[in-house]
């Protein structure tokens, strides 16, 4: 029968007695930077080319037993998970292995850098189809390793890495913390985060998604027909590398940004039990388990968006946090969140010719997060329209006044320390789809975009008094681009997008002694692209 | 990565006569920074990745590496260039004493220096 992990990543329409989705990633080359491998194993024979690259440190101490089959264990298993004949994800993908880990499974940042450079040079000498680089390794945060990954990604290579097995914030490790790399955490057959001894999968905002990583059957280096189960975030990353190979084989022109958005879009949502994660990491950790798309084509019509959280600002009075989108993504909205509720909102601003999302801490606050909504919107022309604080009784308003521009997001930023002491008016922004409304003492920023066939609408859900959280979701066929809160008083902790749902968090009414006049409303801006839909139909 | 002392010796002797000036001093106001792994047991002191500014050419990387060796030799330190990077990042990998970091950070074109560290199978 089909192993649990392959079943988990397979859409129902492919599930038969055997795992055989269309196209096995045959147009894609996957580079594996790991231990040596047993290339004559029946699972991977003829599929993996062992390069002559080797850069490994000496094994520690005298207790080490150099025996080929034992040195090959980790790499052989992963090669099998990516492209193995029987238990592989992308059975048609070809692989090339580089040895950067010794028999102990230990390597160096410098050896990994030289390996990445080798791949780049190979790519320049002999350009082939799409390249996926699998980095099933982790070290401490490394500026240089992250920089090298960024350069390789900008050269069109898709990098996939393990989040790490340290039950810790993945942002403290490299290459897991590199924004350009697809970072994968591990889940088990019960969709629980994987526990490994007393530790387990890493988590946090630097993880892009999770994938099967416990009790994964794959090639064993003990013999050429042996199989073994292994667990770890390496195994999870190997699944995503395989899925990426399948997607790229079906659509070789996909950019890294497009591939990442598709991986997120086709993932199983909200199946992970978040209680396993530390409380302060739950909101930052994506509740996504990787899966293959239900069909290899036809996703192009969708407007894809993802949520990007910034690092924590820190607690100083003027601290700010910045969330950035990838180079070929558009920032369609910006929001902020503070666990203490002490924040001064957020704004979209230009930095290096690109819009970024900046959140502002307030005096006495423990710090803030900026949350960017990053979308794939071809031929988009976006700008930010700002209205300074109105000071008048009806609050501040700003709208998209340019012809053909639609509102994709609203942000508000204020200089006063606590808006809660300045009672806002009761706002009724309904029926004004191209307008942002906010507190009279706040400056309001509207993200206005022009793109072929782009249409957006505002959806709201309000409750009479704060009850922890308010949500509003976009319906099928529409994509959440903006998420904000009204009226933005001090009991609102912030707003953020989770998949297609806008979440507004606030302090519970029982602890704040608020009155019902301080209703909290979650405001979602839902968009779709008729242009992308038409283009897709024309293709079919 | 063999690092026999013989190789060390040979390189240093060959560089003794190298010009040892700081003609191309770092641009005013830009200070190169030093980075190392936050997890002590994973640190590999004695090996450093010297990362040069983005547009630095291979020839400049090689020249900067040679300058470091020459200046180190003048101070009585052995160094070994293990690899010169080009293609992804400009820079070089050097085996040297940590005592030389201050000197290396002042070299022209240097953006930052990172102490090597371990990575592990996951």
């Amino acid at each position: 029968s089909i192993p649990w992990n392959l079943e988990r990543i397979t859409p129902p329409r492919y599930r038969a007695d055997e795992y055989q989705p269309p196209d096995g990633g045959s147009l894609v080359e996957v580079y594996l930077l790991d231990t040596s491998i047993q290339s004559d194993h029946r699972e991977i024979e003829g599929r993996v080319m062992v390069t002559d690259f080797e850069n490994v440190p000496e094994e520690d101490g005298t207790r080490f037993h150099r025996q080929a089959s034992k040195c090959d264990s980790h790499g052989t298993h992963l090669a099998g998970v990516v492209s193995g004949r029987d238990a592989g994800v992308a059975k048609g993908a070809s692989m090339r292995s580089l040895r950067v880990l010794n028999c102990q499974g230990k390597g160096t940042v410098s050896g990994t850098l030289i390996g990445l450079e080798f791949i780049r040079k190979s790519q320049l000498v002999q350009p082939v189809g799409p390249l996926v680089v699998l980095l099933p390794l982790a070290g401490g945060y490394s500026r240089v390793l992250n920089a090298a990954c960024q350069r390789l990604a900008r050269a069109g290579v898709v990098l996939v890495t393990a989040a790490g097995n340290f039950r810790d914030d993945a942002c403290l490790y490299s290459p897991a913390s590199a924004p350009e790399v697809i970072t994968v955490g591990a889940t088990n057959a019960q969709d629980q985060p994987v526990t490994l001894g007393t530790l387990g999968t890493n988590f946090g905002r630097c993880v892009d998604l999770f994938a099967p990583g416990e009790d994964i059957i794959g090639a064993s280096s003990d013999c050429s027909t042996c199989f073994v189960s292994q667990s770890g975030t390496s195994q999870a990353a190997a699944h995503v590398a395989g899925i990426a190979a399948m997607m790229l084989s079906a659509e070789p022109e996909l950019t890294l940004a497009e591939l990442r958005q598709r991986l997120i879009h086709f993932s199983a949502k909200d199946v992970i039990n978040e209680a396993w994660f530390p409380e302060d990491q739950r909101v930052l950790t994506p509740n996504l388990v990787a899966a293959l798309p239900p069909s290899t084509h036809g996703a192009g019509w969708q407007l894809f968006c993802r949520t990007v959280w910034s690092a924590h600002s820190g607690p100083t009075r003027m601290a700010t946090a910045i969330a950035r989108c990838a180079p070929d993504e558009e920032l369609l909205s910006c929001s902020s969140f503070s666990r203490s509720g002490k924040r001064r909102g957020e704004r979209m601003e230009a930095q290096g010719g690109k819009l970024v999302c900046r959140a502002h801490n307030a005096f006495g606050g423990e710090g803030v997060y900026a949350i960017a909504r990053c979308c794939l919107l071809p031929q988009a022309n976006c700008s930010v329209h700002t209205a300074p604080p109105a000071e008048a009784s009806m609050g501040t308003r700003v709208h998209c006044h340019q012809q053909g521009h639609v509102l994709t997001g609203c942000s508000s930023h204020w200089e006063v320390e606590d808006l809660g002491t300045h009672k806002p008016p009761v706002l009724r922004p309904r029926g004004q789809p191209n307008q942002c409304v906010g507190h009279r003492e706040a400056s309001i920023h509207a993200s206005c975009c022009h793109a072929p066939g782009l249409e957006c609408k505002v959806k709201e859900h309000g409750i009479p008094a704060p009850q922890g959280q308010v949500t509003v979701a976009c319906e099928e066929g529409w994509t959440l681009t903006g998420c904000s809160a009204l009226p933005g008083t001090s009991h609102v902790l912030g707003a953020y997008a989770v998949d297609n749902t806008c979440v507004v968090r606030s302090r519970d009414v029982s602890t704040t002694g608020s009155t019902s006049e301080e209703a909290v409303t979650a405001v979602a801006i839902c968009c779709r692209s008729r242009h992308l839909a038409q283009a897709s139909q024309e293709l079919q | 990565q063999e690092d026999e002392d013989g190789d060390y010796e040979e390189l240093v002797l060959a560089l003794r006569s190298e010009e040892d000036g700081l003609a191309e001093a770092p641009e005013h106001g830009t200070t190169a920074t030093f980075h190392r792994c936050a997890k002590d047991p994973w640190r590999l002191p004695g090996t450093y990745v010297v990362v040069l500014k983005e547009e630095t050419h291979l020839s400049q990387s090689e020249r900067t590496a040679r300058r470091l060796q020459a200046q180190a030799a003048r101070r009585g330190y052995l160094t070994k260039i293990l690899h010169v990077f080009h293609g992804l990042l400009p820079g070089f990998l050097v085996k040297m004493s940590g005592d030389l970091l201050e000197l290396a950070l002042k070299l022209p074109h240097v953006d930052y220096i990172e102490e090597d560290s371990s990575v592990f199978a996951q």
């Epitope: 005298t62 207790r63 034992k70 490994l196 007393t198 | 592990f120």
Partner: antibody, heavy 123, light 112 residues
Framework: EVQLVESGGGLVKPGGSLRLSCAAS????????MNWVRQAPGKGLEWVSS????????SHADSVKGRFTISRDNAKNSLYLQMNSLRAEDTAVYFC????????????????WGQGTMVTVSS | ESVLTQPPSVSGAPGQRVTISCTGS?????????VHWYQQLPGTAPKLLIS???NRPSGVPDRFSGSKSGTSASLAITGLQAEDEADYYC???????????FGGGTKLTVLG
């Protein structure tokens, strides 16, 4: 349920040999390092031997080096300790214990232990 | 003699707080390797009590806490209860021995 069950203990004469086994179940055995720890009657815990997940790394305490050999069979989810040239001071309860193999990045705690098997070396 | 040093015994009355120290050297605790603590009740296998210096596995009461500083570590037990009477062992990794090391063990007696 995660479980380790030791077997093979017994009475043996000094100079004799014994082979202990530890059967593992309920977890991905081949991703864990495995250990033997012993406890002489009325005494403390003493680490004896370790073996990494793929057997590439083996370590023994100085007190047993050259006499004891640790091994494993991942296909059978089993750990072994071959004890030769046994001495009276090897008399102890022998426990097998697991720790996740972090490839020397981290040395984890022994989070699961077997119930132990008694080895008595006496003439 | 054990590589890690623990006091042979400690005692305390119910409800009291006791601490058990564990002293190592620059090749084990001082080298940055984590310290783990085990509880062994009479006639049973050891049970993990604290991992990674200060982390409590699920099911371990929050009366137990661990800390580490320099070349030593300590286990603290607050609100002492009769069922805490047991032997306690610290453990770490030693790079010079390429293996694990245990403390000699501390017998905790709950008075009264």
């Amino acid at each position: 349920e995660v479980q380790l069950v030791e077997s093979g203990g017994g009475l043996v004469k000094p100079g004799g040999s014994l082979r202990l086994s530890c059967a593992a179940s309920g977890f991905t055995f081949s991703s864990y390092s495995m250990n033997w720890v012993r406890q002489a009657p009325g005494k403390g815990l003493e680490w004896v031997s370790s073996i990494s997940s793929s057997s590439h790394y083996i370590s023994h305490a100085d007190s047993v080096k050259g006499r004891f050999t640790i091994s494993r069979d991942n296909a059978k989810n089993s750990l072994y300790l071959q004890m030769n040239s046994l001495r009276a001071e090897d008399t102890a309860v022998y426990f097998c214990a697991r720790d996740y193999d972090f490839h020397s990045a981290y040395y984890d705690a022994f989070d699961v232990w077997g119930q132990g098997t008694m080895v008595t070396v006496s003439s | 003699e054990s590589v890690l040093t623990q006091p042979p015994s400690v005692s305390g009355a119910p409800g009291q707080r006791v601490t058990i120290s564990c002293t190592g050297s620059s090749s084990n605790i001082g080298a940055g390797y984590d310290v783990h603590w085990y509880q062994q009740l009479p006639g049973t296998a050891p049970k993990l009590l604290i991992s990674g210096n200060s982390n409590r596995p699920s099911g371990v009461p929050d009366r137990f806490s661990g800390s580490k500083s320099g070349t030593s570590a300590s286990l603290a037990i607050t609100g002492l209860q009769a069922e805490d009477e047991a032997d306690y062992y610290c453990q770490s990794y030693d790079s010079s021995l390429s293996g694990s090391v245990f403390g000699g063990g501390t017998k905790l007696t709950v008075l009264g």
